[in-house]
Amino acid sequence: HTAAQDNCTCPTNKMTVCSPDGPGGRCQCRALGSGVAVDCSTLTSKCLLLKARMSAPKNARTLVRPNEHALVDNDGLYDPDCDPEGRFKARQCNQTSVCWCVNSVGVRRTDKGDLSLRCDELVRTHHILIDLRHRPTAGAFNHSDLDAELRRLFRERYRLHPKFVAAVHYEQPTIQIELRQNTSQKAAGDVDIGDAAYYFERDVKGESLFQGRGGLDLRVRGEPLQVERTLIYYLDEIPPKFSMKRLT
């Protein structure tokens, strides 16, 4: 059984308020900022986590070349609107009535506009490329050991089904992890690749979202794998719509 039952805490989300007021006196946890009840046996959605973060007090080459439609999250933090299931609403607006459309991981995929901007649907991010540079080690990691350890990490820590880890590429010191998940592949209860990628990003930055003080401890054959840079590319099922002036 989990500490959530003993101490009434949320193992998968430290940005929650928990109390034993669920059915039968069971521990129930709600996300900060939104008050939405979360399932502490799995990852909390990125939208609810960003909302909680904004409400908290301020403090032969094997490598993949991302295509021209790949998005990088350059806009930084914002206080998002989430739907009742915790997903990002397709249209996001700030306090000054500037609006834009986002994909399923909350990254802007159109130019910014005003309140008349329409975002017809939430476009799914189906391919995520996590690009890492690891700190110097005595020698290169063995590729198959690294591959196995990262797949196990995503399965055990982030509860992501192994079929969604498409590939692990390695060219010292660069590691690339490819996550793929089409709308048709994602079954009820499956962790979303966007949520797994966000938890991983926070982990490698030393900002773990999991309860407890320990943080991520990742080793390959006993050798610590420490990340010094992370870049994440997001590819959507429908390419983004930006005007040409953005490219100049």
Epitope: H1, T2, A3, A4, D6, N7, T9, P11, T12, R152, L153, E156, R157, S208, F210, Q211, G212, R213, G214, G215, L216, D217, L218, R219, G222, P224
Partner: nanobody, 126 residues
């Protein structure tokens, strides 16, 4: 689903030995912080010993030199070898695991551990 199941508890005379075991399922024990805690009647749960994913171990001052924590990666089990037992070691002993791929920090805190076994009773008589 992660499950921890302790065994090996029992009654022993002071100065005797016991070996506790914890069978781990649904989790690779070698990838995360694992430990033993104990709780005597009317007292707080206290950390006894932990083992990190690196294999490095730490024991509480009260059991140093007497208790040894170890892990069998092939069998996915955690053990606690207890020697020179004292009456004050009498308690319910719990096996605990942190969320997968989590590190161990000192001082030991039960709040850092997600998964718990049901416990096994150790009674030491003088």
């Amino acid at each position: 689903q992660v499950q921890l199941q302790e065994s090996g508890g029992g009654s022993v005379q002071a100065g005797g030995s016991l070996r506790l075991s914890c069978a781990v399922s649904g989790l690779t024990s070698s990838t995360t912080c694992m430990g033993w805690f104990r709780q005597a009647p009317g007292k707080e749960r206290e950390g006894v010993a932990v083992i990190r994913s690196s294999g490095e171990t730490t024991a509480a001052d009260s059991v140093k030199g007497r208790f040894t924590i170890s892990r069998d990666n092939a069998k996915n089990t955690l053990s606690l070898q207890m020697t020179s037992l004292k009456p004050e070691d009498t308690a319910m002993y719990y096996c605990a695991a942190a969320w997968p791929y989590s590190g161990c920090l000192l001082p030991l805190s039960s709040g850092d551990f997600t998964y718990w076994g049901q416990g096994t009773q150790v009674t030491v008589s003088s």
